[in-house]
Structure formats: structure tokens, C-alpha cells
Interface confidence: low
């Protein structure tokens, strides 16, 4: 019996087609992805093949103005229109709190939403009961397939699930649910979830009875053969893991942002064992036309976005200096504003010992692309912020050793004075440079804000200590020459859309007046 699994993950609000790098579509003839194009391909496959499942492995939420405005209603509407068969909860589905998941998505979705390792307690338990499930048995042709869900247990540090949801260890939580499916005579089981490729492989290895793992969170691109675009494969598609009980378990992920549709064909024997698996992600490029009815629907929903982008989010009573003359040479107040917003967005008081789990932010000055003039009545709009942060990136959480941070700050000024983008703006960090010293030895003082303290204060950076830092995904991926971050990071979790972080902060503060306050000094 043959099953076709179509899968997406980490779509992050890319409902419209995007450019090749998943930013705003500039030249339509070269754009990719989007739900209208995805629907064309899915329908084509549904027409051609008998047993098809369309699955999503989480993180539909967060990433563009679509989510900012529609807050998840757009996800439910268009996933319903595409007739998804199941979805796993990702960490970003909790970005607007549990209410922001229940009302727009859980109550509106016409497909099961899954996670076996999230347990509700207290008053929430009855409120959320039945709205998401640990597993679901789906009829496919003449057979049944069990789908069991999972979500990153780091979600409390990455999003806003509140105090009434407990995120258990994935493997511990999955095993009893799979065992239950076996007792129900379900012998074809897919683990669908959002914990990253390393955990996907562990699940394939450790959870008895799981036949296929469809994952997300790490934006992993797998491909067999010559890759069709810029993404470099982390391994073959599917990635085969040998389980502890000797089975070959295919593991798949489909990069992110709706650029690809994962396409996996599995052949099962009559006892539900996987005999063979093969496939590849399908690049959703402009050779695949956008479905006209979905596209028309997108255009209808778009109108509200255009109105939103010119509305006032808040006010500034000072000039927000985002000029390259400032932000690439010295501390600039636009850099301070953005870093303060990044930290504010990551306030998670999850431990009495820590006032927060992260206190530091770094931001490449070259990523700040425009100032905002306070003389326009002080008004700040989404449109203004899109000029400051035009690349559609995310502000991510990483763990780094102090020694890596020191290297990053040396890199920040290694060719100072040429107006290059790697000059770092900061939050929760005090740095002093001596430019008379040779490159690689210019950081003379680097103090960082403590987290394990009731009164935050600045202490000297310790080379061997592991620190959490918020930074743009561009830096986490080694951009602007920060190869040491990419090579030495100990953990990397994708965060919220950059503009969304800053806009939320400005809306929350109402009036802002960031200053240049001595975070970066030259001796």
C-alpha cells in the first residue's frame, strides 16, 4: 500500500508568494511559494495519486504583516481552503498567548491540530479540552494512518504559552500515545512535530512504532540529487534513521517559508512496515501557476494589510537615527531602540533565580536601513519600520560561549571606519574599543548584564560561560562575516519577525525617546 505525504513546516505567515530568499516578492516572474501556488501543486498531486495526506509541522504563525494584522485567522482560513489533513503545534503558535491560539486557529480549523507532549492544567484544561489532540487516526483510501504530534519543550523560553501548559519531554510523551495507537490496530504511524531535526532523528530512533517522522523548527533542507535553488542540503531526502529496534525510519523536513512542498512516497507492507521511501521537496517556483480562486481570496484579504501599514503604531519624540553614518560607526539610538525591543519581546520570567532568561542583544548596524524623523508629528507606522528593517528577518535566540561573543565584538571593529555593516549595536552589553590597537585586539572592556540576579548589573564577560543572546537570524547564519557565531553557536531558535518585534514594543510603550547612553565607547 502506497502513501504520499505532502508536508510543509515553518511557513511563517508567507501566504503570498515571496522572492527566492523568502522576503517580499519584488519581481513576480521570479517569485516562489505562497498558498495559491501551493494549492495548485497539491491539487495536481491529489488528482494524480490515490492516497495523499497534506500535513503541516508547525510555525504557521509569525513572520509577516499578515500575522500582525490577522493574528492567526489567516492561517485557519487558508489552511482550511487547502484542505490540510493535520497540523502539529509549533512554538510560534503561542506567540499571542493561549487565547491567541484558541480563538483564531483551534476553534476555526477544520483539520486536527496535534501535540502529545503539551498537557493543560488548572482552569485551562477544560477550556482547551478537545481543541488540540495528542494524535488523530485518519482514513486514507481503504486504510487508516495514525498521526501523533509533538512540540518543542523549549516553547516556554521561545514564546508565550503561559503557566497552565506543561511541555513534557517529546520521547517520554510520544511513546504511550504510539502504544495506544497500536492497541487500536493502527499499524501505520507518522510522528508530526516541531522540535528540530536533531529531535526528529531521536524520535525516529527511540520511539517504538513510529514509521515516519515529519518535522520542523530547524528549517532543515534535505534533498537527494542536485538542489534546485540556493538552499544547501543537510542530508538526503528522506534522511534514514535506524531505530533501536532495527527498523529504517524516514525523517523529513521541507526547509521553511512555503518555498518547497515536501513530497514523500512511502510503501507499506500488509503489517504496516515501511518497505520503501523516496521523494524530494518540490520547489514552488513560477513554473507552477498560482491558483486563481485562492489568489483572488488572497487579494481580498490583502486590502486590510495595506490600510494597516499606514496607521500609527506609536510616537517618537526624538529623531530615530538609523543612518549608516551613525549606526555603522557608533552607538545609534535606532540600534538601542531595536535592541531594547528585542529584549522586551523575550521577557519570560520562568525561574525565580533569574529576572529573565536573556539580557543581551547584538544587531549589525548594516541591518538598520533608514532613520525615522520625529518631525512628522512623531508618528511611527509599520511602513516606516519596513524601511528601517526591510529584509524580513527574524530576531532569534542563540546560546554562545563568552569567547565567541568576544570574537564577534573584535569582528565588529576589525576594519572600522569603512562604513561596513558588521559594526554591532547592542543591548545589555557595555563595550569599550581602542581603535589604536591592531584588529583582533581592539575590545578593551566587555561587560554584560547579569540574568541570575534580582537587581540587574553589568559584570565582565566570562570566556567559558554560556550566554543567551538575541540577534538577527542574519547574524546567527554567519552574515556580515560573523562566521564565528554560525560555527560556534551551541543552540539556535528562530524568533519573531523583526518588524513585528519593534512595532509591538512601540505600541506597548506608546511614546518612545531612545537615547545614546554609553553602551558603546571608544577609549
Amino acid at each position: 500500500w502506497e502513501l504520499t505525504i505532502l508536508h510543509t513546516n515553518d511557513v511563517h505567515s508567507r501566504l503570498e508568494q515571496t522572492s527566492e530568499d523568502s522576503s517580499k516578492c519584488v519581481n513576480a516572474s521570479r517569485c516562489m511559494g505562497g498558498v495559491a501556488r501551493l494549492f495548485t501543486k497539491v491539487q495536481q498531486i491529489r488528482r494524480a495519486e490515490p492516497n495523499v495526506l497534506l500535513l503541516d509541522a508547525g510555525d504557521q504563525y509569525q513572520g509577516t504583516i499578515w500575522f500582525t494584522v490577522y493574528k492567526g485567522a489567516e492561517v485557519a482560513h487558508f489552511m482550511n481552503a487547502l484542505r490540510y489533513d493535520a497540523m502539529a503545534l509549533g512554538n510560534h503558535e503561542f506567540d499571542n498567548g493561549v487565547e491567541g491560539l484558541i480563538e483564531p486557529l483551534l476553534k476555526e480549523a477544520k483539520f486536527p491540530i496535534l501535540s502529545a507532549n503539551i498537557k493543560a492544567k488548572g482552569p485551562l484544561a477544560s477550556q482547551i479540552s478537545g481543541l488540540y489532540l495528542p494524535y488523530k487516526v485518519l482514513p486514507v483510501g481503504d486504510e487508516v494512518v495514525g498521526i501523533v504530534g509533538y512540540t518543542s519543550k523549549e516553547t516556554p523560553f521561545l514564546s508565550n504559552p503561559g503557566t497552565n501548559l506543561v511541555f513534557e519531554d517529546e520521547i517520554t510523551a510520544l511513546q504511550p500515545e504510539v502504544d495506544k495507537l497500536k492497541t487500536l490496530n493502527v499499524n501505520k504511524i507518522i510522528a508530526l512535530g516541531h522540535s528540530g531535526f536533531e529531535m526528529d532523528k531521536l524520535i525516529a530512533q527511540k520511539v517504538r512504532g513510529v514509521d515516519v517522522v515529519v518535522g520542523g523548527h530547524s528549517n532543515t533542507f534535505l534533498y537527494t540529487g542536485n538542489p534546485p535553488s540556493k538552499e544547501v542540503p543537510a542530508g538526503k531526502y528522506p534522511f534514514i534513521v535506524t531505530s533501536d529496534d532495527g527498523r529504517k525510519v524516514p525523517v523529513v523536513q521541507a526547509y521553511a517559508f512555503g518555498k518547497y512542498l515536501g513530497y514523500l512516497k512511502i510503501e507499506f507492507d500488509e503489517r504496516g512496515n515501511v518497505i520503501s521511501s523516496h521523494g524530494n521537496p518540490i520547489l514552488l517556483n513560477s513554473s507552477i501557476p498560482e491558483d486563481p480562486s485562492i489568489k483572488a481570496d488572497i487579494n481580498k484579504w490583502r486590502i486590510k494589510l495595506d490600510n494597516y501599514s499606514t496607521q500609527e503604531l506609536g510616537k517618537t519624540i526624538v529623531y530615530l537615527d538609523g543612518s549608516s553614518q551613525s549606526c555603522r560607526f557608533r552607538e545609534c539610538n535606532m540600534g538601542n531602540l531595536i535592541c531594547d525591543a528585542m529584549i522586551n519581546n523575550n521577557l519570560r520570567h520562568t525561574d525565580e533565580m533569574f529576572w529573565n532568561h536573556v539580557s543581551m542583544c547584538i544587531l549589525n548596524g548594516g541591518g538598520i536601513r533608514s532613520p525615522i524623523d520625529e518631525r512628522n508629528n512623531g508618528t511611527i507606522t509599520w511602513e516606516n519600520l519596513a524601511a528601517v528593517l526591510p529584509f524580513g528577518g527574524t530576531f532569534d535566540l542563540v546560546q554562545l560561549k563568552g569567547s565567541t561573543l568576544k570574537k564577534a565584538f573584535e569582528h565588529s571593529v576589525h576594519r572600522y571606519g569603512q562604513s561596513t555593516g558588521e559594526f554591532l549595536q547592542v543591548g545589555g552589553i557595555h563595550v569599550v574599543y581602542d581603535l589604536s590597537r591592531k584588529p583582533g585586539d581592539r575590545v578593551v572592556k566587555l561587560d554584560v548584564l547579569c540574568t541570575k540576579c534580582r537587581v540587574p548589573s553589568y559584570d565582565p564577560l566570562k570566556m567559558d560561560e554560556v550566554y543567551k543572546v538575541i540577534l538577527p537570524n542574519f547574524l546567527a547564519n554567519g552574515g556580515d562575516g560573523f562566521q564565528m557565531i554560525k560555527d560556534e553557536l551551541l543552540r539556535h531558535d528562530s524568533g519573531d519577525q523583526d518588524i513585528n518585534v519593534v512595532s509591538t514594543y512601540i505600541s506597548k510603550m506608546k511614546v518612545i525617546y531612545p537615547a545614546v547612553e554609553g553602551r558603546i565607547k571608544f577609549s
Epitope: 527566492e20 537615527d321 536601513r369 532613520p371 569603512q418
Partner: antibody, heavy 118, light 107 residues
Framework: QVQMKQSGPELVKPGASVKIPCKAS????????MDWVKQSHGESLEWIGD????????IYNQKFKGKVTLTIDKSSSTAYMELRSLTSEDTAVYYC???????????WGQGTSVTVSS | DIQMTQSPSSMYASLGERVTITCKAS??????LSWFQQKPGKSPKTLIY???RLIDGVPSRFSGSGSGQDYSLTISSLEYEDMGIYYC?????????FGGGTKLELK
């Protein structure tokens, strides 16, 4: 539509100065930086510098420091480039070019020819 | 300053031919590269920025690619109006620097 309008050709004597205007239209003047580029006859292009119309901030190519001053007049949406102490080496066509959100030049003026001759 | 080495410096091609011009930077320029076309007596016209993003209104036969230090401009099927001089420009680091140009003529 976006346009940069430059003035006509200039014939100037050695040692004199010249101020070339570049009038922008079709977009919000303060939203984009303005770059200036030199092209000597039959040669490639040379980047002179860049001005931010929001705050008048400038970045110059070291090679043109002391030779060139970039200014703006927000009220007329005009950028200016002044060339001082002119010599025959300064004979060239000078272009202004708007930069887009990526700081890449996208729209160019038609160029102003400056000839330095006694 | 970053050196931009463009090649070839001149070339002849036939109508309908696929043409590729390359530009090599003396260091990584993070895809901050533009391509321009200039015709005699005219100002340059921007074709591509950010290495591969087409400016609105530029025909789709023009495409850009590359990363790091190596970049190229391709014309998929040459037309008569494509004759002229092509320049690359890096805008990653000040001072911005142009390539020496490639003169494209009809064979």
C-alpha cells in the same frame, strides 16, 4: 514617475568652482539617499559620495575629499554637488543617482558635463 | 578599496545568443552588487541590485547570480537594444567601486 533632473553642460575656467543641481521628483525626497558618480571621457564610473537628505549626513570617497561638497535643499527636493579648485582632471560627466531601500542606485540623472578649460 | 574585476572587457555576440559577463570582487561583498547598462551619450540604467533582484521594468531576459566574491550577469537571448557597456558596482563597503566595464557589440 521617479526622475532626477540635472542642469545643462558647464564650461568653467581652471581654479573656479561649479555647483551642479539634481532635482528629484516622483517620490518622497527624504526617503532615499542620493549618490554622485563621475565619468571621465571613455572611462569607467567612479563613486564620489552619498548624502542622506534626512539629516544632510555625507560619506565621501577619500579621493574626492576637499574637492567635492554635497548638500541638499529639502524645500525644493534638490541635491547639489559643488566642485572646487577645478583642473582639467575634473573634466567629466557627473551623475546623481537615487538609492533604493537596499542602498543600491536605482534611478539616475541624465548627467551634467563639466569642461574645465582656459 | 575593494577592486572589482570585470571580464571580458569587450565582446562580440549574435542576436539570440546567451551572453554572460562576470565580475569578481577582491573580497566578499555579501551580494551587495548591482549591474548597469550604459549606451553612448546616455546615463547608466540600473538592471539588477542585490546580485539577483531585477529592477522594475527591466526585461526578464536579464538575470544576475553569484555570491561571495563572484558574480555574473546573463542575457538569455541577446536583442539589438542590449548593445552597450555593462558595469558592475559593489555597494557593500565604502567607497563603492565599479568594475571597468564590458563593451558588448554585435557580431
Amino acid at each position: 514617475q521617479v526622475q532626477m533632473k540635472q542642469s545643462g553642460p558647464e564650461l568653467v575656467k581652471p581654479g573656479a568652482s561649479v555647483k551642479i543641481p539634481c532635482k528629484a521628483s516622483g517620490y518622497t525626497f527624504t526617503d532615499s539617499n542620493m549618490d554622485w558618480v563621475k565619468q571621465s571621457h571613455g572611462e569607467s564610473l567612479e563613486w564620489i559620495g552619498d548624502i542622506n537628505p534626512n539629516n544632510g549626513g555625507t560619506i565621501y570617497n577619500q579621493k574626492f575629499k576637499g574637492k567635492v561638497t554635497l548638500t541638499i535643499d529639502k524645500s525644493s527636493s534638490t541635491a547639489y554637488m559643488e566642485l572646487r579648485s577645478l583642473t582639467s582632471e575634473d573634466t567629466a560627466v557627473y551623475y546623481c543617482a537615487r538609492t533604493n531601500w537596499d542602498y543600491a542606485m536605482d534611478y539616475w540623472g541624465q548627467g551634467t558635463s563639466v569642461t574645465v578649460s582656459s | 578599496d575593494i577592486q572589482m574585476t570585470q571580464s571580458p572587457s569587450s565582446m562580440y555576440a549574435s542576436l539570440g545568443e546567451r551572453v554572460t559577463i562576470t565580475c569578481k570582487a577582491s573580497q566578499d561583498i555579501n551580494s551587495n552588487l548591482s549591474w548597469f547598462q550604459q549606451k553612448p551619450g546616455k546615463s547608466p540604467k540600473t538592471l539588477i541590485y542585490r546580485a539577483n533582484r531585477l529592477i522594475d521594468g527591466v526585461p526578464s531576459r536579464f538575470s544576475g547570480s553569484g555570491s561571495g566574491q563572484d558574480y555574473s550577469l546573463t542575457i538569455s537571448s541577446l536583442e539589438y537594444e542590449d548593445m552597450g557597456i555593462y558595469y558592475c558596482l559593489q555597494y557593500d563597503v565604502f567607497p563603492r567601486t565599479f568594475g571597468g566595464g564590458t563593451k558588448l557589440e554585435l557580431k
